[in-house]
């Protein structure tokens, strides 16, 4: 057992251009606050997947009020360590999320409100009781300070708090076969319990006759070293010089156990040891609790129903996420139709429509009709948040307002001649065709496919068409 | 014509995974918003979450946060929805619909998942 | 999260009569409420939006109203192919939810 911990020196804006904008201001001071997520091993794990090894929360930081017009400088910070205690071996290879966090405190309906400022990750080797490991991270302009370590808590003892101490039963040394306790040289290391032979830097064990295996090493004895990338040679016993062993077939060929879990051959096929916080065939479930505390923003923690959900957030309106840790921009609904731009309010949706389009939604094309008539009798037809004029016989333009050339569409048929009139236009029909548009023959014994002509107009005579 | 086309029938054994897809022809997918409804036998509707077809980025109900994964295909115009470790309480029958930013618009036919021993 | 209840279960009518589907919501949804369709083979269709919008193809006998948390859809002369269960839901916070649903019959 022992503690991960880790010291914030500084969050603020990173070196060269574009610095970030003071993240609080007069009208909205806010404080900066910390959480840490640790998994085991060297995973590339998505943000949201559970912080096996443990995470943990700062104190809040003191309220900070930008001064006006001056550059974001390094931001107050909480006092004091972010500590995550862990129960069993440090694993020696590990996972880190550290998480700045914003608290508006304005006038905000119902409490503070909570916001992600910047997410940093990275995987790192580290013995526990080593000392102070400082490191630089940045995301976007920010940039984060930091120095952790991994301490054991006595009585353990170790590069993975896996040897036991225990206070000196002589004064003056230990008993037989056991050494000092460095560094608590008054103390003495507990009598090895473990299995017989298992590696006293890869193993560690929690029950007599026990060998369970650090991260990267597995084997009955946790002396075989998981990777084998290095090892080019054809299949065949360890080599000796380069300390690579090159695994002939077998059912813990290639790892099946993940997140950190050793493989051990059983008669019909393997197990896999997991650490803690991972379970299953191949220690593929991960389990946090709710007692990890693992939802922000007020969600509530309610345990899963089986072993794959350990827990479930229940997120309190505005929030989303498996940990509640992101706000909901219900503008990822989609909701604005037709080009319109989203911008959601908090207390309400809004869509800023395109030109020629309303509605909440911009579900409606606008009728551009309305207060604009059509000149000389023309109608407005819309459409595709435009309008446009079907103009009456003789007009044209945008709004009928031009005079148009009736003769231009060469509308009289079989060679009538046209004319311009002012109703409209007149066909001259050539011989043997008769109509408004000459379109009808004249029969040959000299009777009309019309009914009889109208009084005073004989065929082929220039027929007005109104 | 709008429609939402859902692939068939799935019958599989519990921890298992399915992934069902969802086709969408007649309109612009990335435009509107994927939705997924489930419907256990008998049962009514109950409202799984979202997908932004623009950006990818999935929004789930609390009851289907972790085994549930909602994806996109914006080439071929398809959603999908992907139950992981598939349990007895999952048979159902899914739906995906469209969001026209009032309701849900438009349907797929729905898709009928089995999970038995 | 918002509950939806619709009282009644199921409901028989005959053929030509008016009926009115109610719907109420645990708290204020700001009319942003739909009424869908289910019929028997499964298929489901919006036919309402915004409390009392039509949707495009559906018949104008189907007609919405309410406001606040109490909202009804009236199918106002029932025909043979509105046999169906239909589901109110509201659209106005997050997680959306769907009413227990209304088996309509014909007697």
């Known amino acids: 057992a022992g503690v991960f911990e880790l010291q914030i020196h500084s969050f603020g804006p990173g070196p060269g251009p574009g610095a970030p904008r003071s993240p609080c201001s007069a009208r909205l001071p806010c404080r900066l606050f910390f959480r840490v997520c640790l998994k085991p091993g060297l995973s590339e794990e998505a943000a949201e997947s559970p912080c096996a090894l443990g995470a943990a929360l700062s104190a809040r930081g003191p309220v900070y009020t930008e001064q006006p017009g001056a550059p974001a400088p390094d931001l107050p910070l909480p006092d004091g360590l972010l500590q995550v205690p862990f129960r069993d071996a440090w694993p020696g290879t590990f996972s880190f999320i550290i998480e700045t966090w914003r608290e508006e405190l304005g006038d905000q309906i119902g409490g503070p409100a909570w916001s992600l400022l910047a997410r940093v990750a990275g995987r790192r080797r580290l013995a526990a009781g080593g000392p102070w490991a400082r490191d630089i991270q940045r995301a976007g302009a920010w940039e984060l300070r930091f120095s952790y370590r991994a301490r054991c808590e006595p009585p353990a003892v170790g590069t993975a708090c896996t040897r036991l101490c225990r206070p000196r039963s002589a004064p003056s040394r230990c008993g037989p076969g056991l050494r000092p306790c460095a560094p608590l040289e008054d103390e003495c290391e507990a009598p090895l319990v473990c299995r017989a032979g298992c590696s006293p830097e890869h193993g560690f064990c929690e029950q007599p006759g026990e060998c369970r295996c650090l991260e990267g090493w597995t084997g009955p004895l946790c002396t075989v070293p998981v990777s084998t990338s290095s090892c080019l040679s054809p299949r065949g016993p360890s080599s000796a010089t380069t300390g690579c062993l090159v695994p002939g077939p077998g059912p813990c060929d290639g790892n099946p156990c993940a997140n950190g879990g050793s493989c051990s051959e059983t008669p019909r096929s393997f197990e896999c040891t997991c650490p803690r916080g991972f379970y299953g065939l191949r220690c593929e479930v991960s389990g946090v609790t709710c007692a990890d505390g693992p939802c922000f923003n007020g969600g509530l923690c309610v345990g899963g129903a089986d072993p794959d959900s350990a827990y479930i957030c229940h997120c309190p309106p505005g929030f989303q996420g498996s940990n509640c840790e992101k706000r909901v921009d219900r503008c990822s609904l989609q909701p604005c139709r037709n080009g319109g731009l989203c911008l959601d309010l908090g207390h309400a949706l809004r869509c800023r429509c395109r030109a020629g389009f309303a509605g909440p939604r911009c579900e409606h094309d606008l009728d551009d009709c309305a207060g604009r008539a059509c000149a000389n009798g023309g109608t407005c037809v819309e459409g595709g948040g435009a309008h446009r004029c079907s103009c009456a016989l003789g007009f044209g333009g945008r709004d009928c307002r031009e005079r148009a050339d009736p003769c231009a569409a060469r509308p009289c048929a079989h060679g009538g001649r046209c004319y311009a009139h002012f109703s409209g236009l007149v066909c001259a029909c050539a011989p043997g065709y008769m109509g408004a548009r000459c379109e009808f023959p004249v029969h040959p014994d000299g009777a009309s496919a019309l009914p009889a002509a109208p009084p005073g107009l004989r065929p082929g005579d220039p027929q007005r068409y109104l | 014509q709008i429609q939402l086309v859902q692939s068939g029938p799935e019958l599989k054994k519990p921890g298992e995974t399915v992934k069902i897809s969802c086709k969408a022809s007649g309109y612009t997918f990335t435009d509107y918003s994927m939705h997924w409804v489930k419907q256990a036998p008998g049962k009514g509707l109950k409202w799984m979450g979202w997908?932004?077809?623009?950006?990818?980025?999935?929004g789930y109900a609390d009851d289907f946060k972790g085994r549930f994964a909602f994806s996109l295909e914006t080439s071929a115009s398809t959603a999908y929805l992907q139950i992981n470790n598939l349990k007895n309480e999952d048979t159902a029958t899914y739906f995906c619909?469209?969001?026209?930013?009032?309701?849900?618009?438009?349907w797929g036919q729905g898709t009928s998942v089995t999970v038995s021993s | 999260d918002i509950q939806m209840t619709q009282t009644t279960s199921s409901l028989s009518a005959s053929l030509g009569d008016r009926v009115t589907i109610s719907c109420r919501a645990s708290q204020d949804i700001s009319n942003y409420l739909n009424w869908y369709q289910q019929k028997p083979d499964g298929t489901v269709k919006l036919l309402i939006y915004y409390t009392s919008r039509l949707h495009s193809g559906v018949p104008s006998r189907f007609s919405g109203s309410g406001s606040g948390t109490d909202y009804s859809l009236t199918i106002s002369n029932l025909e043979l192919e509105d046999i169906a269960t239909y589901f109110c839901q509201q659209g106005d916070m997050l997680p959306w939810t769907f009413g227990g649903g209304t088996k309509l019959e014909i007697k």
């Open positions: 619909a469209r969001y026209d930013g009032y309701a849900m618009d438009y």
């Open positions: 997908i932004n077809t623009h950006t990818g980025e999935p």
